[in-house]
């Protein structure tokens, strides 16, 4: 039960995390104009991974896509790549984890296969979360560097008296969404990996041995190994049938794991 809960919770947390990574990647507010200690302008600039926007006090918002690939900073390209890799891995992880869920029965899939799939999806979620966190952190570092550079020469003199204001950018909402989402995906992945340990059957299956005593024919089945599958008291804990009708094929698919005398 605890394994199912851990797996299910891991799946849900990862799902929320990946949705957050997708949202962060699509958001326009990766960097926003720093309003602190700045002259009050009637325009508010903010930038995303794919386009930059300007919101005027008139209510008019204009966004322009980055219609160049080669002209963009390498760091921005790297962040894009990390976020996309994170989304792709997360999406594949979600797909795999759906089939790995203990509460879902697909044909004659063994628990060992489900355990492997749970572990695979868990690792994918961990890598996905790390990609997102790395992408957001790289962008944040880029912002901090640029912020202090532009602060150093915030007002650049132009022709003596005339001044031009340099727009400084600070952390946008997408960064926080990305960090939280990456963290959730990472946590979800760890939970899936933990659930995998509970799902995995022990490799050693103790074969039942027949002992023939005089006058009696008793078959002894060694029990007491909680982790062993299909033996002793553990059979009672094994939920072979998930409720509802089963086809004969489905029922027949399970006894292959059990050894009978």
């Amino acid at each position: 039960m605890a394994v199912t809960a851990c797996q299910g919770l891991g799946f849900v947390v990862s799902l929320i995390g990946i949705a957050g990574i997708i949202a962060a990647t699509c958001m326009d507010q990766w960097s926003t104009q720093d309003l602190y200690n700045n002259p009050v302008t009637a325009v508010f600039n903010y930038q995303g991974l794919w386009r930059s926007c300007v919101r005027e006090s008139s209510g008019f918002t204009e966004c322009r896509g980055y219609f160049t690939l080669l002209g963009l900073p390498a760091m921005l390209q790297a962040v894009r790549a990390l976020m996309i890799v994170g989304i792709v891995l997360g999406a594949i992880g979600l797909l795999v984890s759906i089939f790995a869920l203990k509460c879902i029965r697909i044909g004659s899939m063994e628990d060992s296969a489900k355990a492997n799939m749970t572990l695979t999806s868990g690792i994918m979620f961990i890598v996905s979360g790390l990609c997102a966190i790395a992408g957001v952190s790289v962008f944040a570092n880029m912002l901090v560097t640029n912020f202090w550079m532009s602060t150093a020469n915030m007002y650049t003199g132009m022709g003596g008296m005339v001044q031009t204001v340099q727009t400084r950018y600070t952390f946008g909402a997408a960064l926080f969404v990305g960090w939280v989402a990456g963290g959730l995906t990472l946590i979800g992945g760890v939970m899936m990996c933990i659930a995998c340990r509970g799902l995995a059957p022990e490799e050693t299956n103790y074969k039942a041995v027949s002992y023939h005593a005089s006058g009696h024919s008793v078959a002894y089945k060694p029990g007491g190994f909680k982790a062993s599958t299909g033996f002793g008291s553990n059979t009672k804990n094994k939920k072979i049938y998930d409720g509802g009708a089963r086809t004969e094929d489905e029922v027949q698919s399970y006894p292959s794991k059990h050894d009978y005398v």
Partner: antibody
């Protein structure tokens, strides 16, 4: 068709108060920034206040800050300018205007005259 | 505050001739985010409210004759009327729409010579 109609102007004594109204129609009022601009007799244009579209932030020049308050009622499609502690130099025609691209003012009302005199 | 200085204060031009009005701001009105200059030009005739001619320094408002054009960037801007018509007699104002407070130039009175 965009229409802006100002009202509430008149004669007031120095130190007195007045509330100007601007009834808007022909557009989604809440989405646009709105401004008040004044023009003293025979003088140039002077920006008085702006209330931004959406978030309703308000802005004023130092000459009226603390004395004038711009507000809007999106349900009534109305813009207001509450003027307190009026001075003789506040005498002007007050125009209500709607913002658009570049924070420009493509639509203006016909104006309402405010005279501050003892 | 941003100071907007127009020149000349008044201008007399013959019908059909080119009229040029200049506007200088004390700070750059160029927004790096969209590379647009937040400068606006208005025309005001006696007894009427101002009429928008040009926004973003060079974008003509719809319905404005194409003889009106705006140019310039940063701090120096120009309004040009390529061929003056009788109906163009008015006072012209430039306005800073980038920094608060939004400041107007003192106006340029355009007359027919």
């Amino acid at each position: 068709e965009v229409q802006l109609v100002e009202s509430g102007g008149g004669l007031v004594k120095p130190g007195g108060s007045l509330r100007l109204s601007c009834a808007a129609s022909g557009f989604t009022f809440s989405s646009y920034g709105m401004s008040w601009v004044r023009q003293a007799p025979g003088k140039g244009l002077e920006w008085v206040s702006t209330i931004s579209g959406g978030d309703s932030y308000t802005y004023y020049p130092d000459s009226v800050k603390g004395r004038f308050t711009i507000s809007r009622d999106n349900a009534k499609n109305s813009l207001y300018l509450q003027m307190n502690s009026l001075r003789a130099e506040d005498t002007a025609v007050y125009y209500c205007a709607r913002s658009y691209n570049g924070n420009s003012l493509p639509y203006w009302g016909q104006g309402t005259l405010v005279t501050v005199s003892s | 505050d941003i100071v907007m200085t127009q020149s000349p204060d008044s201008l007399a031009v013959s019908l059909g001739e080119r009229a040029t009005i200049n506007c200088k701001s004390s700070q750059s009105l160029l927004n790096s985010g969209n590379q647009r200059n937040y400068l606006t030009w208005y025309q005001q005739k006696p007894g009427q409210p101002p009429k928008l001619l040009i926004y973003w320094a060079s974008t003509r408002e719809s319905g404005v004759p194409d003889r009106f054009s705006g140019s310039g960037s940063g701090t120096d801007f120009t309004l040009t009327i390529s061929s003056l018509q009788a109906e163009d007699v008015a006072v012209y104002y430039c306005q800073n729409n980038y920094f608060y407070p939004f400041t107007f130039g003192q106006g340029t009175k355009l007359e027919i010579k």
